[in-house]
Interface confidence: medium
C-alpha cells in the first residue's frame, strides 16, 4: 500500500479551496503551522488551518447538513402537501355537489318550498364545510337546525297552505313540535349518525395530513447542535487542513456521525411508522357511512324521504299540531 | 319519488369524459396516497444512511478519511471515528431530542390516538329500527350503513358517485338564484368533466 501523500508544503491548494468558501486569504496560513489553537481539526503535525477557518468550516458543514436534510424530505413533503390540498378541494367539491343535489330535489319536487329551503340547505352545507375544516360546530345541532327550519315551511306551504306564513309565533311552536312529535320519524337521527360519522372521519383525515406536513417541516428546519457541527466539520473538512482535498470520509464513519447528529430526529421514527399505519387503518374504514362522499351525495334522497314521511302522516300531524299550536294560531287569525 | 339529480342534470349523450379509463374516486385516491406514504414508512430511521449516501463518501477509493487520518477503507480504523479525547458520541445521543422534536412527537402521539379511536372495529351504529319511533314505519332496516337512500325507491344508491377527476359543472341556477323555480331538463344541462385536481405522484 503506498504511503499517504505528504501534506501540501505551501498550503497553496488549501488556500485556493478555502477561497471559494470565504473570500480573502487572511485566515489561511502561507505554510503549515502548529495549529495549537484549533479545537476541532486537532492536528497530528503541522496544519494548513487556522481557528477562523475552522469556524467557517463549521458554518459550511451545518448549512450542508440542512440542505441534505431538506433534499431528503422534499419528495415526501411534496406528496403530503399536494394530497392535503387535493383532498381539501375534493371535499369542498363533494359538499358543493351535495348542496346542488339537495336544492335540485327541492326545486323539482317541492317548488313552493324552494326559496326558503335553498337558504336552509345553504346554511347546513356551509356548516358542513366549516366542520370539515376544523370549526367547533356540533353536527347534531346542524341537522336539528335544518329540520327545525324546514318543518314550519313544510307545514305552512304543503300541509296547511291556508295559513299565513309570516307569523313568527306559530313558527316557534312548529319548531318545538317537530322534535316533540318526531315529525320526520327517525330520519333526522339517521342523518345525524351518517353525517357525524362521515364528517368526523373526513376531518381527522385532513388533520392527520396537515400534521404530517408539520412533522416534515419541523425536521426539515432543525438546528443542529454545536457538537454535531464539530463532528460534521471533522468528517467533511478536517482532511483539507492536511492538504487532502480529494479524500472522502469512510462510509462507516459517516454513519456513526449521522446517527449521533440525528439521534433526536430518529426518535420520531416509531411514531411516524404508527402514524402511517393508523392513517391506513382509517382510510380502509372510510366506506359506507364513514365515507362523506357516499353520505353527502345521498342526503338529498334521505331528505326527500323524510318529507314524504311527513306527507304520509299529514292527517294525524295536522290534527295534533292544530291542538298543540292552537294558541299561536288564534293570535295569528285575530 | 325524488328526481335523481343525475337524471335531472346529465344527458348521457353529451357527457364528455376526459380520458378517464377507470373511475378514480376519492377512495381510490386515498388508497393510492397510503401506498405511497407506506414507501416512506422508514423515512426517519433511514435518514442517517440517506444523508451519507448523498454526501461525499468513499465508495471505490482504497483510502478514506476517518476524522483524524487517512486509512484503508476496510480497516478497523475506518469504522472508528477518530473522536478520542473529544466529546463523546454517547453523550450526544444521551442529550435527547430537541424541544421542537419532543413537541412534534407529542402531536404525533395525539393524532395516532385519535386515528386509532376512529378506526375501531365498527359495529352497528343504530340498533333500533327506524319504525320504532315517530308516526309510521320508514323502509330502512336496522343496518343503517346500507341505508343511505332511505325509503321511497327502495335502497337508493347514488348512481353516479362523484368522479374524483371530474368536476361536475352544473349550469343550473340552483346556487345563485334561489327564487328561480323553472324546471330543468337534461338537455339544458351539459356536464363537462375535466381534470380539475392535479395528479400527484
Amino acid at each position: 500500500q503506498p504511503p499517504p501523500p505528504p501534506p501540501d508544503a505551501t498550503c497553496h491548494q488549501v488556500r485556493s479551496f478555502f477561497q471559494r468558501l470565504q473570500p480573502g486569504l487572511k485566515w489561511v496560513p502561507e505554510t503549515p503551522v502548529p495549529g495549537s489553537d484549533l479545537q476541532v481539526c486537532l492536528p497530528k503535525g503541522p496544519t494548513c488551518c487556522s481557528r477562523k477557518m475552522e469556524e467557517k468550516y463549521q458554518l459550511t458543514a451545518r448549512l450542508n447538513m440542512e440542505q441534505l436534510l431538506q433534499s431528503a424530505s422534499m419528495e415526501l413533503k411534496f406528496l403530503i402537501i399536494q394530497n392535503a390540498a387535493v383532498f381539501q378541494e375534493a371535499f369542498e367539491i363533494v359538499v358543493r355537489h351535495a348542496k346542488n343535489y339537495t336544492n335540485a330535489m327541492f326545486k323539482n319536487n317541492y317548488p313552493s318550498l324552494t326559496p326558503q329551503a335553498f337558504e336552509f340547505v345553504g346554511e347546513f352545507f356551509t356548516d358542513v364545510s366549516l366542520y370539515i375544516l376544523g370549526s367547533d360546530i356540533n353536527v347534531d345541532d346542524m341537522v336539528n337546525e335544518l329540520f327545525d327550519s324546514l318543518f314550519p315551511v313544510i307545514y305552512t306551504q304543503l300541509m296547511n297552505p291556508g295559513l299565513p306564513d309570516s307569523a313568527l309565533d306559530i313558527n316557534e311552536c312548529l319548531r318545538g313540535a317537530r322534535r316533540d312529535l318526531k315529525v320526520f320519524g327517525n330520519f333526522p337521527k339517521l342523518i345525524m349518525t351518517q353525517v357525524s360519522k362521515s364528517l368526523q372521519v373526513t376531518r381527522i383525515f385532513l388533520q392527520a395530513l396537515n400534521l404530517g406536513i408539520e412533522v416534515i417541516n419541523t425536521t426539515d428546519h432543525l438546528k443542529f447542535s454545536k457538537d454535531c457541527g464539530r463532528m460534521l466539520t471533522r468528517m467533511w473538512y478536517c482532511s483539507y487542513c492536511q492538504g487532502l482535498m480529494m479524500v472522502k470520509p469512510c462510509g462507516g464513519y459517516c454513519n456513526v456521525v449521522m446517527q449521533g447528529c440525528m439521534a433526536g430526529v430518529v426518535e420520531i421514527d416509531k411514531y411516524w411508522r404508527e402514524y402511517i399505519l393508523s392513517l391506513e387503518e382509517l382510510v380502509n374504514g372510510m366506506y359506507r357511512i364513514y365515507d362523506m362522499e357516499n353520505v353527502l351525495l345521498g342526503l338529498f334522497s334521505t331528505i326527500h324521504d323524510s318529507i314524504q314521511y311527513v306527507q304520509k302522516n299529514a292527517g294525524k300531524l295536522t290534527t295534533t299540531i292544530g291542538k298543540l299550536c292552537a294558541h299561536s294560531q288564534q293570535r295569528q287569525y285575530r | 319519488s325524488a328526481y335523481y339529480p343525475e337524471d335531472l342534470f346529465i344527458d348521457k349523450k353529451v357527457l364528455k369524459v376526459a380520458h378517464v379509463e377507470h373511475e378514480e374516486t376519492l377512495s381510490s385516491r386515498r388508497r393510492e396516497l397510503i401506498q405511497k406514504l407506506k414507501s416512506f414508512i422508514s423515512f426517519y430511521s433511514a435518514l442517517p444512511g440517506y444523508i451519507c449516501s448523498h454526501s461525499p463518501v468513499a465508495e471505490n477509493d482504497t483510502l478514506c478519511w476517518n476524522g483524524q487520518e487517512l486509512v484503508e477503507r476496510y480497516s478497523q480504523k475506518a469504522a472508528r471515528n477518530g473522536m478520542k479525547n473529544q466529546f463523546n458520541l454517547h453523550e450526544l445521543k444521551m442529550k435527547g431530542p430537541e424541544p421542537v422534536v419532543s413537541q412534534i412527537i407529542d402531536k404525533l402521539k395525539h393524532i395516532n390516538q385519535l386515528l386509532r379511536t376512529m378506526s375501531m372495529p365498527k359495529g352497528r351504529v343504530l340498533d333500533k329500527n327506524l319504525d320504532e319511533e315517530g308516526f309510521e314505519s320508514g323502509d330502512c332496516g336496522d343496518d343503517e350503513d346500507e341505508c343511505i337512500g332511505g325509503s321511497g325507491d327502495g335502497m337508493i344508491k347514488v348512481k353516479n358517485q362523484l368522479r374524483f377527476l371530474a368536476e361536475l359543472a352544473y349550469d343550473l341556477d340552483v346556487d345563485d338564484a334561489p327564487g328561480n323555480s323553472q324546471q330543468a331538463t337534461p338537455k339544458d344541462n351539459e356536464i363537462s368533466t375535466f381534470h380539475n385536481l392535479g395528479n400527484v405522484h
Epitope: 459550511t60 440542505q67 433534499s71 438546528k223 | -
Partner: nanobody, 120 residues
C-alpha cells in the same frame, strides 16, 4: 446563467439604517445558501452573514451580531441585509454570493457589489 444583482447602497449617517437587496436569477434560488460579504477600501474581503436555502438558519460574523439581519424571500428570488445602527467602519462594498452546494465544483458566484458609505 447565474446572475446576482445588489442594490440599496448609498451614503448614510452614523446610527441610521439601510436595507440591501440582492436579486438572483439563473438558478433554483431556494436550493442554495446565500451570503453577504463586504470589502472595505484597501482591506481584505470580510464575511458578514449567511442564510440557509429555506431561510430557517442564519449566521453572522461575531462583530456584527445584533445590528445586521439577513433574510430571504424565495418567492421573489431575493436576498436581503437589514443594517441598523450603522458605524463608520461599516463603510464597504457589499457583495452577495451564492454558497457552493455540497459536492459542486469549487467556483462560486458573486454580484457586482453595492457601495455603502457611513459618514456624517
Amino acid at each position: 446563467q447565474v446572475q446576482l444583482v445588489e442594490s440599496g447602497g448609498g451614503v448614510v449617517q452614523p446610527g441610521r439604517s439601510l436595507r440591501l437587496s440582492c436579486a438572483a436569477s439563473g438558478f433554483t434560488f431556494s436550493s442554495y445558501a446565500m451570503s453577504w460579504v463586504r470589502q472595505a477600501p484597501g482591506k481584505e474581503p470580510e464575511w458578514v452573514s449567511s442564510i440557509s436555502g429555506g431561510g430557517s438558519s442564519t449566521y453572522y460574523a461575531d462583530s456584527l451580531k445584533g445590528r445586521f439581519t439577513i433574510s430571504r424571500d424565495n418567492s421573489k428570488n431575493t436576498l436581503y441585509l437589514q443594517m441598523n445602527s450603522l458605524r463608520a467602519e461599516d463603510t464597504a462594498v457589499y457583495y452577495c454570493s451564492r454558497d457552493p452546494r455540497f459536492g459542486e465544483p469549487p467556483f462560486d458566484y458573486w454580484g457586482q457589489g453595492t457601495l455603502v458609505t457611513v459618514s456624517s
